[in-house]
């Protein structure tokens, strides 16, 4: 299974200090992964290469994303990317890419969280994306 | 074979101007790779995807890591990641990720070197890690 | 098929506001990919993991690279990496890595473009490289 996702939109709930991205498939091979709003549901357990990039346009001193999984009654951070940002708006433009190999369980929900309220993201599909490759 | 490693600790020898990371397996499939203190020993020769991320909290003007291999009487750089760092300690927070595909030989020792004495690293397992996927 | 490429040189045509990199193979397995000057020709259609890193030594406010494909009469951006750069030349040193999974067609030409005239790149093979893994 292979899945490459690109953004539909990004939102912060009113009382939340995080921003989440809603995803849609750009490339899909196999049935083992299912885009589901702000998350991706794992249908086939196994070892996956996961990758995530977010394009930030924000003067907040550091920006980044956390890729986490929720399943079997608990939430776990898999990996994160952190980028210090310039304070000048014209210069505050950075992509943050990270990736890793993890064992995912059937029913896990994977999500990308930016731990900032109303984070200023560029949702271009070549700047912000999320992907899975079953190994 | 698949191996995803996370840090145990990082040290600079007294007379050394580099910082090295000691690794432990977080995910392991197959017997082809063996964590060995500050290095990873290749048991099965072949073509591997290698990836490395280090999370820096350091105001030194540029930080980064070098992934190198030692084997058959030679040491060589495989790839490197470089990140310019802000001079203000509160802002100096950057992850540096890189990866590539390389032919590794039996007996090679792979290591991650930060070419700075006493580099200030964040050894969180979701911020600093090292991985191998046999292709 | 696997292909890891390193730079031969980088040039900007006189009237152009982009810099392109000419590539040579460092590791090659299979016949499905062919380095061809500033591009890589796809011989075998399929789903590929592509990765790209460029090492910048440039004080231009933001630097980065675009990985695009040309084929079937059109050009398409696959992914890009963006890095804000310090204004001081001694600090302006950043690698920019990105990667993703894409379906490539026979005859496609893949290239790495830096959308800056005469971009100051470090063409060390460990800092600037391009790779493909057929999944």
């Amino acid at each position: 299974s292979v899945l490459h996702l690109v953004p539909i939109n990004a939102t912060s709930k009113d009382d939340s200090d995080v921003t989440e991205v809603m995803w849609q498939p750009a490339l899909r091979r196999g049935r083992g992964l299912q885009a589901q709003g702000y998350g991706v549901r794992i249908q086939d357990a196994g070892v996956y290469l996961l990758y995530s990039q977010v394009l930030f346009q924000d003067v907040t001193f550091t920006m980044g994303q956390v890729v986490s999984r929720e399943g079997q009654g608990r939430q776990e951070t898999l990996f994160r990317c952190i980028r210090s940002m310039p304070s000048h708006p014209d210069r505050a433009y950075n992509s943050c890419y990270s990736a890793g190999v993890f064992h995912l369980h059937q029913g896990d929900i994977l999500s990308v969280i930016i731990p900032r309220a109303r984070a200023k993201l560029n949702l271009s599909p070549h700047g912000t994306f999320l992907g899975f490759v079953k190994l | 074979s698949v191996l995803h490693l996370v840090p145990i600790n990082a040290t600079s020898k007294d007379d050394s101007d580099v910082t090295e990371v000691m690794w432990q397996p977080a995910l392991r499939r197959g017997r082809g790779l063996q964590a060995q203190g500050y290095g990873v020993r290749i048991q099965d020769a072949g073509v591997y995807l290698l990836y490395s991320q280090v999370l820096f909290q350091d105001v030194t003007f540029t930080m980064g890591q070098v992934v190198s291999r030692e084997g058959q009487g030679r040491q060589e750089t495989l790839f490197r990641c470089i990140r310019s760092m802000p001079s203000h300690p509160d802002r100096a927070y950057n992850s540096c990720y890189s990866a590539g595909v390389f032919h590794l030989h039996q007996g090679d020792i792979l290591s991650v070197i930060i070419p700075r004495a006493r580099a200030k690293l964040n050894l969180s397992p979701h911020g600093t890690f090292l991985g191998f996927v046999k292709l | 098929s696997v292909l890891h490429l390193v730079p031969i040189n980088a040039t900007s045509k006189d009237d152009s506001d982009v810099t392109e990199v000419m590539w040579q193979p460092a590791l090659r397995r299979g016949r499905g990919l062919q380095a061809q000057g500033y591009g890589v020709r796809i011989q075998d259609a399929g789903v590929y993991l592509l990765y790209s890193q460029v090492l910048f030594q440039d004080v231009t406010f933001t630097m980065g690279q675009v990985v695009s494909r040309e084929g079937q009469g059109r050009q398409e951006t696959l992914f890009r990496c963006i890095r804000s750069m310090p204004s001081h030349p001694d600090r302006a040193y950043n690698s920019c890595y990105s990667a993703g999974v894409f379906h490539l067609h026979q005859g496609d030409i893949l290239s790495v473009i830096i959308p800056r005239a005469r971009a100051k790149l470090n063409l060390s093979p460990h800092g600037t490289f391009l790779g493909f893994v057929k999944l």
């Epitope: - | 580099v18 190198s68 058959q72 030679r74 040491q75 060589e76 490197r80 | 390193v6 193979p25």
Partner: antibody
Framework: QVQLQQSGPELVKPGASVKLSCKAA????????INWVKQSPGQGLEWIGW????????KYNDKFKGKATMTADKSSSTAYMQLSSLTSEDSAVYFC??????????????WGQGTSVTVSS | DVLMTQTPLSLPVSLGDQASISCRSS???????????LEWYLQKPGQSPNLLIY???NRFSGVPDRFSGSGSGTDFTLKISRVEAEDLGVYYC?????????FGGGTKLEIK
């Protein structure tokens, strides 16, 4: 472009030590090993050893252990080789050479101009 | 140590002639990975050595195509198809497969 600039000629007394330098430019110093090679007068070439500046690791030809000590200073992109307890047998030209390690080969692709060491009382 | 023996010691040639230099190793210079790190270097009078050939037969960038390397195991050859004046000097073979790495004794290419 890649350059290796070696220090000037040395005239030293028997039993003394000498430290030769090799300043690198035009590439990332820590990414490539520096080899040292000896050429005695009218003779061929002998490999002394290498240092990898990225980690400080070294590999010596057993013949030169105790005679040669290789070091590297990353801040100045300079490799050094100290020769100790000098005798007339150590009179030679010493070369530093960068070893490349990509595009499928290893080889000493760039060389310094050499430093002449003469041991004489 | 691997002993590298070059023949001849001296090779007088006329400009435009072909020249051939042999290098024989005391044991195989194939390393445990299956790679043969056999190189050829040219040292012109008063200069540093220059890399000509790596991994038996691959020309280094900028080296004219009149230079070619061949061989395997313990027997290697460097050929110059048409000798030019700038080719004069001492040619060394070198093995980087087994530590300590070793050079041949050299072959001096000179004008007849």
């Amino acid at each position: 472009q890649v350059q290796l600039q070696q220090s000037g000629p040395e005239l030293v007394k028997p039993g003394a030590s000498v430290k030769l330098s090799c300043k690198a430019a035009g590439y990332i110093f820590t990414d490539y090993t520096i080899n040292w090679v000896k050429q005695s007068p009218g003779q061929g070439l002998e490999w002394i050893g290498w240092i990898y500046p990225g980690s400080g690791n070294r590999k010596y030809n057993d013949k030169f252990k105790g005679k040669a000590t290789m070091t590297a200073d990353k801040s100045s992109s300079t490799a050094y080789m100290q020769l100790s307890s000098l005798t007339s047998e150590d009179s030679a030209v010493y070369f530093c050479a960068r070893e490349s390690n990509y595009v499928g080969y290893y080889a000493m692709d760039y060389w310094g101009q050499g430093t002449s060491v003469t041991v004489s009382s | 140590d691997v002993l590298m023996t070059q023949t001849p010691l001296s090779l007088p040639v006329s400009l435009g002639d072909q020249a051939s230099i042999s290098c024989r190793s005391s044991q195989s210079v194939v390393n445990s990975n299956g790679n043969t790190y056999l190189e050829w270097y040219l040292q012109k009078p008063g200069q540093s050595p220059n890399l000509l050939i790596y991994k038996v037969s691959n020309r280094f960038s900028g080296v004219p195509d009149r230079f070619s390397g061949s061989g395997s195991g313990t027997d290697f050859t460097l050929k110059i198809s048409r000798v030019e004046a700038e080719d004069l000097g001492v040619y060394y073979c070198f093995q980087g497969s087994h530590v300590p790495w070793t050079f041949g004794g050299g072959t001096k290419l000179e004008i007849k």
